[in-house]
C-alpha cells in the first residue's frame, strides 16, 4: 500500500476576471483495487448513491476527471447498491482517470479495497482519511473549480505542476 501524494489546486476567480490558485498537499494510499500510477484531472465530487444508476448514457463529464467519493457510515447505508470496489469501477467506466475515497466514516472500506482483485482497475484508486480527508473535503465542498494531481513520488516544487 504505497503512499499517494495528492496535490489539490483550487481556482478562485476575482471580480476583475483574474483568478488566484491555492495549492494544498495531502497524502493518501494507493489501494490494490487500482494501479499505482500518477493521474491528474478536474475534481468531480460524487455522492455514493450517484454511482448507483446504471445508465451508461449518464456520462456527464468528459474523460479525465478525478472522482472524489465520501463514503457514509455503514449504518446510514445498510444496503449499498454497489461494493466500494464496484463504485470505483463505475466511476472509471464513466471516465474517471482516478478515484479518491474518503474512508473516514467507513474505514472497513480500506480492507475491501485492498483485498486484491483478480482484475484490478487500470487507474489509481486512492483512499484518504483523518486530517488529509478533512483538507480534501473542505476544498471539494467549496464547489469551485479544483484540480487534483496524484503521484506516487513526493512532489517537487508546486510551480512545476499545472500548465495554465
Amino acid at each position: 500500500k504505497e503512499t499517494a501524494f495528492v496535490e489539490v489546486v483550487l481556482f478562485e476567480s476575482s471580480p476583475s476576471g483574474d483568478y488566484t490558485t491555492y495549492t494544498t498537499g495531502l497524502t493518501g494510499r494507493f489501494s490494490r483495487a487500482g494501479a499505482t500510477l500518477s493521474a491528474e484531472g478536474e475534481i468531480v465530487q460524487m455522492h455514493p448513491l450517484g454511482l448507483c444508476n446504471n445508465n451508461d448514457e449518464e456520462d456527464l463529464y468528459e474523460y479525465g476527471w478525478v472522482g472524489v467519493v465520501k463514503l457514509e457510515q455503514p449504518e446510514l447505508d445498510p444496503k449499498p447498491c454497489l461494493t466500494v470496489l464496484g463504485k470505483a469501477k463505475r466511476a472509471v467506466q464513466r471516465g474517471a482517470t482516478a478515484v479518491i475515497f474518503d474512508v473516514s466514516e467507513n474505514p472497513e472500506a480500506i480492507d475491501q479495497l485492498n483485498q486484491g482483485s483478480e482484475d484490478p482497475l487500470k487507474r489509481p484508486v486512492v483512499y484518504v482519511k483523518g486530517a488529509d480527508a478533512i483538507k480534501l473535503m473542505n476544498i471539494v465542498n467549496k464547489q469551485k473549480v479544483a484540480r487534483a494531481r496524484i503521484q506516487h513520488r513526493p512532489p517537487r516544487q508546486p510551480t512545476e505542476y499545472f500548465d495554465m
Partner: antibody, heavy 118, light 110 residues
Framework: EVQLVGSGGGLVQPGRSLKISCAAS????????MAWVRQAPTRGLEWVAT????????YYRDSVKGRFTISREYAKSTLYLQMDDLTSEDTATYFC???????????WGQGVLVTVSS | QAVLTQPNSVSMSLGSTVKLSCTLN????????VHWYQQYEGRSPTTMIY?????PDGVPDRFSGSIDSSSNSAFLTINNVEIGDEAIYFC?????????FGGGTKLTVL
C-alpha cells in the same frame, strides 16, 4: 485469520452485574463495527447491541436499553459488554461478532455463557 | 415489530435439494440484505450466504441464496445435501434499524 475470543461469563444472581469481553485479532479492530448477539438455551439468535467502528455510537435492543453498555478498547483490540440489573431473561450464550458492510455479522466469537439464577 | 419466520425443522434425504424459506411479515424484504448463517450444535454461527446471494470464500457452490419479492421471502437452497449439512440455519436482516433473526430451521439429513 480473524479470531474473536470471548471470556468472562459465569453464574450471577438476579439484580447483579457482569462484564464480558471479546478479544479480537487477525484484522484491524478500529476499522469495524462490533456487536453482541445472544442465544438462550434451545432458542434462536437475538441481537443485543452494536458499537460503531470509532465507538461514537452504540445501539441496543429495547429489552436491554439502560441496563447494558457496549464499549471497546482499541489498545487491547477488545470489545466489552457491561450487563447490569440482570434478570433470568438474560441467561444465554453471548457471541461477539464483527459487523461489516450490508449489516452482516461476518465473523463470530465462540460464545460466553451467562447464567442468571439465584 | 418486524419478524422473520422460518420453518422449525426440515428433513431431507441425502443427495436431494432443499430450499429453506425466511419470510418477512412487514415491510419489503428487498429493502435490506438478507444473510444466512449455519450453526452446528454447541458451536458459533458461520456465514453461508451474505447480501442476499453472495457466497463467502470456502462455502461450497451447493449453497445459494435468493429473494422472492412476491412472497416477501428469502431462500437458502442447498443442492446435493450431505450429512455435514445437518445443522440449524438462521436468516438475518437489518429492518428499521434493528437486527432481526429468523427462529432458525433445523435441517436433518436422512
Amino acid at each position: 485469520e480473524v479470531q474473536l475470543v470471548g471470556s468472562g461469563g459465569g453464574l450471577v444472581q438476579p439484580g447483579r452485574s457482569l462484564k464480558i469481553s471479546c478479544a479480537a485479532s487477525g484484522f484491524t479492530f478500529s476499522y469495524y463495527g462490533m456487536a453482541w448477539v445472544r442465544q438462550a438455551p434451545t432458542r434462536g439468535l437475538e441481537w443485543v447491541a452494536t458499537i460503531t467502528y470509532n465507538g461514537s455510537k452504540s445501539y441496543y435492543r429495547d429489552s436491554v436499553k439502560g441496563r447494558f453498555t457496549i464499549s471497546r478498547e482499541y489498545a487491547k483490540s477488545t470489545l466489552y459488554l457491561q450487563m447490569d440489573d440482570l434478570t433470568s431473561e438474560d441467561t444465554a450464550t453471548y457471541f461477539c461478532a464483527r459487523r461489516t458492510t450490508g449489516m452482516l455479522f461476518d465473523y463470530w466469537g465462540q460464545g460466553v455463557l451467562v447464567t442468571v439464577s439465584s | 415489530q418486524a419478524v422473520l419466520t422460518q420453518p422449525n425443522s426440515v428433513s431431507m434425504s441425502l443427495g436431494s435439494t432443499v430450499k429453506l424459506s425466511c419470510t418477512l411479515n412487514s415491510g419489503n424484504i428487498e429493502n435490506n440484505f438478507v444473510h444466512w448463517y449455519q450453526q452446528y450444535e454447541g458451536r458459533s454461527p458461520t456465514t453461508m450466504i451474505y447480501n442476499d446471494d453472495k457466497r463467502p470464500d470456502g462455502v461450497p457452490d451447493r449453497f445459494s441464496g435468493s429473494i422472492d419479492s412476491s412472497s416477501n421471502s428469502a431462500f437458502l437452497t442447498i443442492n446435493n445435501v450431505e450429512i455435514g449439512d445437518e445443522a440449524i440455519y438462521f436468516c438475518h436482516s437489518f429492518v428499521s434499524s434493528i437486527h432481526i433473526f429468523g427462529g432458525g430451521t433445523k435441517l436433518t439429513v436422512l
